[in-house]
Protein backbone atom coordinates (compact mmCIF):
# COMPACT_ATOMS: atom_id res chain seq x y z
CA UNK A 1 0.00 0.00 0.00
CA UNK A 2 0.95 3.69 0.03
CA UNK A 3 3.80 4.72 2.31
CA UNK A 4 2.57 6.65 5.38
CA UNK A 5 3.79 10.29 5.20
CA UNK A 6 5.79 10.05 8.45
CA UNK A 7 7.55 6.87 7.27
CA UNK A 8 8.29 8.40 3.86
CA UNK A 9 9.79 11.49 5.42
CA UNK A 10 11.88 9.50 7.90
CA UNK A 11 13.20 7.13 5.20
CA UNK A 12 14.12 10.03 2.95
CA UNK A 13 15.92 11.79 5.79
CA UNK A 14 17.86 8.60 6.57
CA UNK A 15 18.89 8.21 2.94
CA UNK A 16 20.04 11.84 2.64
CA UNK A 17 22.03 11.48 5.88
CA UNK A 18 23.63 8.35 4.39
CA UNK A 19 24.60 10.27 1.23
CA UNK A 20 26.14 13.20 3.11
CA UNK A 21 28.06 10.94 5.50
CA UNK A 22 29.41 8.59 2.83
CA UNK A 23 30.40 11.28 0.34
CA UNK A 24 34.03 10.96 -0.72
CA UNK A 25 34.62 12.25 -4.25
CA UNK A 26 32.45 15.15 -5.47
CA UNK A 27 28.87 13.88 -5.39
CA UNK A 28 27.58 13.04 -8.90
CA UNK A 29 30.86 14.31 -10.39
CA UNK A 30 29.95 17.84 -9.28
CA UNK A 31 26.74 17.97 -11.33
CA UNK A 32 24.66 21.12 -10.97
CA UNK A 33 20.89 21.20 -10.46
CA UNK A 34 18.24 23.89 -10.15
CA UNK A 35 17.61 25.09 -6.63
CA UNK A 36 14.01 24.76 -5.45
CA UNK A 37 11.60 26.57 -3.18
CA UNK A 38 11.40 24.35 -0.10
CA UNK A 39 7.66 24.82 0.29
CA UNK A 40 4.52 22.96 -0.81
CA UNK A 41 4.98 20.24 -3.41
CA UNK A 42 8.54 19.74 -2.27
CA UNK A 43 8.87 16.04 -3.16
CA UNK A 44 7.86 16.73 -6.77
CA UNK A 45 10.00 19.85 -7.02
CA UNK A 46 13.02 18.01 -5.63
CA UNK A 47 12.44 15.16 -8.09
CA UNK A 48 12.06 17.57 -11.03
CA UNK A 49 15.49 18.92 -10.17
CA UNK A 50 17.31 15.68 -9.33
CA UNK A 51 15.80 13.71 -12.22
CA UNK A 52 18.04 15.71 -14.56
CA UNK A 53 21.08 14.03 -13.00
CA UNK A 54 21.88 10.73 -14.70
CA UNK A 55 24.46 8.07 -13.97
CA UNK A 56 24.85 8.99 -10.31
CA UNK A 57 24.50 5.80 -8.27
CA UNK A 58 24.68 7.71 -4.99
CA UNK A 59 21.32 9.41 -5.52
CA UNK A 60 19.47 6.60 -7.31
CA UNK A 61 17.61 5.55 -4.15
CA UNK A 62 16.69 9.17 -3.43
CA UNK A 63 15.31 9.51 -6.96
CA UNK A 64 13.25 6.34 -6.43
CA UNK A 65 11.87 7.62 -3.14
CA UNK A 66 10.96 11.03 -4.52
CA UNK A 67 9.36 9.40 -7.57
CA UNK A 68 7.25 7.23 -5.30
CA UNK A 69 6.25 10.11 -3.04
CA UNK A 70 5.39 12.54 -5.86
CA UNK A 71 1.78 11.96 -7.01
CA UNK A 72 2.37 12.87 -10.66
CA UNK A 73 4.69 11.69 -13.41
CA UNK A 74 7.95 13.62 -13.67
CA UNK A 75 10.36 13.46 -16.62
CA UNK A 76 13.82 14.87 -17.25
CA UNK A 77 13.69 18.40 -18.61
CA UNK A 78 10.35 19.12 -16.94
CA UNK A 79 10.16 22.25 -14.79
CA UNK A 80 7.52 23.82 -12.59
CA UNK A 81 7.12 27.13 -10.84
CA UNK A 82 8.60 25.47 -7.74
CA UNK A 83 12.09 25.94 -9.16
CA UNK A 84 14.28 28.94 -8.51
CA UNK A 85 15.23 28.97 -12.18
CA UNK A 86 18.07 31.47 -11.88
CA UNK A 87 20.05 29.47 -9.31
CA UNK A 88 22.00 26.29 -9.95
CA UNK A 89 23.81 24.54 -7.12
CA UNK A 90 25.88 21.38 -6.79
CA UNK A 91 23.97 18.17 -6.04
CA UNK A 92 25.87 17.91 -2.73
CA UNK A 93 24.58 21.31 -1.62
CA UNK A 94 21.08 20.48 -2.87
CA UNK A 95 21.08 17.31 -0.75
CA UNK A 96 22.30 19.21 2.33
CA UNK A 97 19.68 21.94 1.92
CA UNK A 98 16.92 19.39 1.39
CA UNK A 99 18.06 17.37 4.41
CA UNK A 100 18.05 20.42 6.71
CA UNK A 101 14.55 21.34 5.59
CA UNK A 102 13.20 17.80 5.94
CA UNK A 103 14.63 17.49 9.45
CA UNK A 104 12.89 20.73 10.37
CA UNK A 105 9.59 19.44 8.98
CA UNK A 106 9.98 16.16 10.84
CA UNK A 107 10.64 17.95 14.15
CA UNK A 108 7.55 20.08 13.58
CA UNK A 109 5.44 17.05 12.69
CA UNK A 110 4.70 18.28 9.16
CA UNK A 111 4.63 14.97 7.33
CA UNK A 112 2.71 15.85 4.15
Amino acid sequence: GPVPPSTALRELIEELVNITQNQKAPLCNGSMVWSINLTAGMYCAALESLINVSGCSAIEKTQRMLSGFCPHKVSAGQFSSLHVRDTKIEVAQFVKDLLLHLKKLFREGQFN
Partner: antibody
Amino acid sequence: EVQLKESGPGLVAPGGSLSITCTVSGFSLTDSSINWVRQPPGKGLEWLGMIWGDGRIDYNDALKSRLSISKDNSKSQVFLEMNSLRTDDTATYYCARDGYFPYAMDFWGQGTSVTVSS
Amino acid sequence: DIVLTQSPASLAVSLGQRATISCRASESVDSYGQSYMHWYQQKAGQPPKLLIYLASNLESGVPARFSGSGSRTDFTLTIDPVQAEDAATYYCQQNAEDSRTFGGGTKLEIK
Protein backbone atom coordinates in the same frame (compact mmCIF):
# COMPACT_ATOMS: atom_id res chain seq x y z
CA GLU B 1 23.49 12.53 -31.87
CA VAL B 2 23.87 9.69 -29.36
CA GLN B 3 25.93 6.79 -30.70
CA LEU B 4 27.59 3.68 -29.26
CA LYS B 5 29.92 1.38 -31.15
CA GLU B 6 31.42 -1.89 -29.98
CA SER B 7 34.71 -3.28 -31.26
CA GLY B 8 36.00 -6.73 -30.41
CA PRO B 9 38.37 -9.49 -31.51
CA GLY B 10 35.87 -11.60 -33.44
CA LEU B 11 37.51 -14.94 -32.67
CA VAL B 12 38.89 -16.10 -29.30
CA ALA B 13 40.32 -19.46 -28.27
CA PRO B 14 38.70 -21.44 -25.43
CA GLY B 15 40.36 -20.60 -22.11
CA GLY B 16 41.46 -17.25 -23.48
CA SER B 17 40.29 -13.79 -22.63
CA LEU B 18 38.09 -11.27 -24.36
CA SER B 19 38.41 -7.50 -24.51
CA ILE B 20 35.68 -5.35 -26.06
CA THR B 21 35.61 -1.57 -26.31
CA CYS B 22 32.48 0.56 -26.47
CA THR B 23 33.17 3.99 -27.93
CA VAL B 24 30.43 6.55 -27.40
CA SER B 25 29.61 9.97 -28.79
CA GLY B 26 26.89 12.57 -28.28
CA PHE B 27 27.03 12.35 -24.49
CA SER B 28 29.52 12.19 -21.63
CA LEU B 29 30.46 9.08 -19.69
CA THR B 30 30.80 11.16 -16.52
CA ASP B 31 27.03 11.50 -16.28
CA SER B 32 25.72 8.44 -18.08
CA SER B 33 25.84 4.74 -17.22
CA ILE B 34 26.78 2.03 -19.70
CA ASN B 35 25.53 -1.57 -19.64
CA TRP B 36 26.99 -4.66 -21.26
CA VAL B 37 24.50 -7.19 -22.62
CA ARG B 38 25.16 -10.32 -24.68
CA GLN B 39 23.05 -12.55 -26.90
CA PRO B 40 24.13 -16.05 -27.96
CA PRO B 41 23.07 -17.00 -31.52
CA GLY B 42 19.32 -17.62 -31.64
CA LYS B 43 18.91 -17.02 -27.90
CA GLY B 44 17.81 -14.28 -25.50
CA LEU B 45 19.48 -11.29 -23.89
CA GLU B 46 21.74 -11.64 -20.85
CA TRP B 47 22.80 -8.63 -18.77
CA LEU B 48 26.50 -8.79 -17.91
CA GLY B 49 27.05 -5.67 -15.87
CA MET B 50 27.26 -1.90 -15.92
CA ILE B 51 29.42 1.05 -14.97
CA TRP B 52 27.73 4.16 -13.62
CA GLY B 53 28.69 7.70 -14.51
CA ASP B 54 30.18 8.13 -11.05
CA GLY B 55 32.25 4.95 -11.44
CA ARG B 56 30.28 2.38 -9.46
CA ILE B 57 30.26 -1.04 -11.12
CA ASP B 58 27.52 -3.68 -10.85
CA TYR B 59 27.98 -7.20 -12.19
CA ASN B 60 25.85 -10.21 -13.04
CA ASP B 61 26.47 -12.37 -9.97
CA ALA B 62 26.85 -15.57 -12.00
CA LEU B 63 29.63 -14.08 -14.16
CA LYS B 64 31.26 -11.72 -11.65
CA SER B 65 34.40 -13.81 -11.20
CA ARG B 66 35.18 -13.71 -14.94
CA LEU B 67 34.21 -10.11 -15.71
CA SER B 68 35.85 -6.72 -15.44
CA ILE B 69 34.29 -3.44 -16.54
CA SER B 70 36.17 -0.15 -16.66
CA LYS B 71 36.14 3.12 -18.57
CA ASP B 72 38.16 6.10 -19.74
CA ASN B 73 35.94 9.17 -19.54
CA SER B 74 38.38 11.36 -21.48
CA LYS B 75 38.40 8.94 -24.43
CA SER B 76 34.64 8.24 -24.20
CA GLN B 77 35.37 4.53 -24.00
CA VAL B 78 34.04 1.71 -21.84
CA PHE B 79 35.81 -1.64 -21.62
CA LEU B 80 34.56 -5.16 -21.01
CA GLU B 81 37.07 -7.88 -20.18
CA MET B 82 36.13 -11.51 -19.73
CA ASN B 83 38.45 -14.41 -18.98
CA SER B 84 38.38 -18.22 -18.98
CA LEU B 85 36.24 -18.18 -22.10
CA ARG B 86 34.15 -21.19 -23.09
CA THR B 87 32.34 -22.02 -26.30
CA ASP B 88 29.03 -20.97 -24.71
CA ASP B 89 30.40 -17.42 -24.40
CA THR B 90 29.96 -17.17 -28.18
CA ALA B 91 27.53 -14.30 -28.63
CA THR B 92 26.87 -10.82 -29.93
CA TYR B 93 28.02 -8.37 -27.27
CA TYR B 94 26.17 -5.05 -26.95
CA CYS B 95 26.83 -1.90 -24.98
CA ALA B 96 23.77 0.15 -24.07
CA ARG B 97 23.31 3.51 -22.39
CA ASP B 98 21.00 4.12 -19.46
CA GLY B 99 18.69 7.06 -20.00
CA TYR B 100 17.63 9.36 -17.21
CA PHE B 101 15.79 7.96 -14.19
CA PRO B 102 14.36 5.25 -14.08
CA TYR B 103 17.46 4.06 -15.95
CA ALA B 104 16.12 1.91 -18.75
CA MET B 105 18.49 1.28 -21.66
CA ASP B 106 17.54 3.89 -24.25
CA PHE B 107 20.38 3.68 -26.80
CA TRP B 108 22.22 0.56 -27.96
CA GLY B 109 25.24 -0.16 -30.10
CA GLN B 110 24.91 -2.46 -33.10
CA GLY B 111 26.82 -5.18 -31.28
CA THR B 112 30.02 -7.06 -31.99
CA SER B 113 30.08 -10.79 -32.72
CA VAL B 114 32.47 -12.92 -30.70
CA THR B 115 33.12 -16.60 -31.45
CA VAL B 116 34.92 -18.81 -28.95
CA SER B 117 36.47 -21.67 -30.89
CA SER B 118 39.74 -23.47 -31.39
CA ASP C 1 18.73 -12.48 -8.66
CA ILE C 2 15.19 -11.80 -9.82
CA VAL C 3 14.16 -14.33 -12.46
CA LEU C 4 11.80 -13.11 -15.18
CA THR C 5 9.67 -15.71 -16.96
CA GLN C 6 7.95 -14.70 -20.19
CA SER C 7 5.01 -16.47 -21.77
CA PRO C 8 4.32 -17.60 -24.31
CA ALA C 9 7.75 -18.28 -25.84
CA SER C 10 6.21 -17.55 -29.23
CA LEU C 11 2.84 -16.54 -30.62
CA ALA C 12 1.22 -15.88 -33.97
CA VAL C 13 -1.35 -13.12 -34.23
CA SER C 14 -3.40 -12.01 -37.21
CA LEU C 15 -2.85 -8.54 -38.60
CA GLY C 16 -5.08 -6.05 -36.79
CA GLN C 17 -5.68 -8.33 -33.80
CA ARG C 18 -4.37 -8.00 -30.25
CA ALA C 19 -1.12 -9.55 -28.99
CA THR C 20 -0.60 -10.07 -25.27
CA ILE C 21 2.74 -11.01 -23.73
CA SER C 22 3.21 -11.87 -20.07
CA CYS C 23 6.23 -11.42 -17.82
CA ARG C 24 6.30 -12.88 -14.31
CA ALA C 25 9.00 -11.98 -11.77
CA SER C 26 10.22 -14.38 -9.08
CA GLU C 27 9.84 -11.55 -6.57
CA SER C 28 8.37 -8.06 -6.56
CA VAL C 29 10.06 -5.44 -8.74
CA ASP C 30 8.17 -2.62 -7.02
CA SER C 31 10.03 0.04 -5.07
CA TYR C 32 8.37 3.03 -3.40
CA GLY C 33 5.19 2.51 -5.38
CA GLN C 34 6.83 2.24 -8.81
CA SER C 35 7.38 -0.91 -10.86
CA TYR C 36 10.93 -1.13 -12.23
CA MET C 37 9.98 -3.22 -15.24
CA HIS C 38 10.78 -2.23 -18.83
CA TRP C 39 9.95 -3.72 -22.24
CA TYR C 40 12.14 -3.94 -25.38
CA GLN C 41 11.53 -4.91 -28.98
CA GLN C 42 14.23 -6.64 -31.03
CA LYS C 43 13.87 -7.17 -34.75
CA ALA C 44 16.04 -9.68 -36.60
CA GLY C 45 19.63 -8.52 -37.01
CA GLN C 46 19.09 -5.37 -34.93
CA PRO C 47 19.83 -4.33 -31.34
CA PRO C 48 16.92 -4.09 -28.90
CA LYS C 49 14.80 -0.93 -28.76
CA LEU C 50 13.19 0.47 -25.59
CA LEU C 51 9.38 0.49 -25.82
CA ILE C 52 8.02 0.94 -22.30
CA TYR C 53 9.58 1.95 -19.00
CA LEU C 54 8.29 1.72 -15.44
CA ALA C 55 5.75 -0.92 -16.52
CA SER C 56 3.38 1.42 -18.35
CA ASN C 57 5.14 4.53 -19.69
CA LEU C 58 5.55 4.74 -23.44
CA GLU C 59 9.04 5.71 -24.62
CA SER C 60 9.13 8.75 -26.87
CA GLY C 61 8.40 7.90 -30.51
CA VAL C 62 6.81 4.52 -29.76
CA PRO C 63 3.34 4.06 -31.34
CA ALA C 64 0.33 4.20 -28.99
CA ARG C 65 -0.72 0.69 -30.01
CA PHE C 66 1.90 -0.53 -27.53
CA SER C 67 0.89 -0.49 -23.89
CA GLY C 68 2.13 -2.00 -20.66
CA SER C 69 0.47 -2.82 -17.37
CA GLY C 70 1.02 -4.67 -14.12
CA SER C 71 2.73 -4.34 -10.76
CA ARG C 72 4.77 -6.31 -8.25
CA THR C 73 5.34 -9.66 -10.01
CA ASP C 74 2.92 -9.77 -12.95
CA PHE C 75 3.29 -7.64 -16.06
CA THR C 76 1.76 -7.51 -19.51
CA LEU C 77 2.77 -5.99 -22.83
CA THR C 78 -0.14 -5.46 -25.21
CA ILE C 79 0.01 -4.59 -28.90
CA ASP C 80 -3.37 -3.59 -30.31
CA PRO C 81 -3.87 -3.60 -33.22
CA VAL C 82 -0.84 -5.59 -34.38
CA GLN C 83 0.89 -4.30 -37.52
CA ALA C 84 3.18 -6.18 -39.91
CA GLU C 85 6.23 -4.26 -38.66
CA ASP C 86 5.64 -5.53 -35.11
CA ALA C 87 7.08 -8.96 -36.00
CA ALA C 88 9.95 -9.18 -33.52
CA THR C 89 11.06 -10.69 -30.22
CA TYR C 90 9.96 -8.85 -27.08
CA TYR C 91 11.85 -8.83 -23.78
CA CYS C 92 10.97 -7.65 -20.29
CA GLN C 93 13.79 -6.38 -18.05
CA GLN C 94 13.94 -5.34 -14.40
CA ASN C 95 16.24 -2.98 -12.53
CA ALA C 96 14.61 -3.18 -9.11
CA GLU C 97 17.87 -4.78 -7.96
CA ASP C 98 21.46 -3.78 -8.68
CA SER C 99 21.80 -7.00 -10.66
CA ARG C 100 19.53 -6.50 -13.65
CA THR C 101 17.86 -9.35 -15.53
CA PHE C 102 15.96 -9.97 -18.76
CA GLY C 103 13.10 -12.32 -19.48
CA GLY C 104 13.67 -15.14 -21.96
CA GLY C 105 11.85 -13.35 -24.76
CA THR C 106 8.63 -13.83 -26.72
CA LYS C 107 8.76 -14.14 -30.49
CA LEU C 108 5.78 -12.52 -32.22
CA GLU C 109 4.81 -13.70 -35.70
CA ILE C 110 2.19 -11.90 -37.77
CA LYS C 111 -0.29 -14.08 -39.65
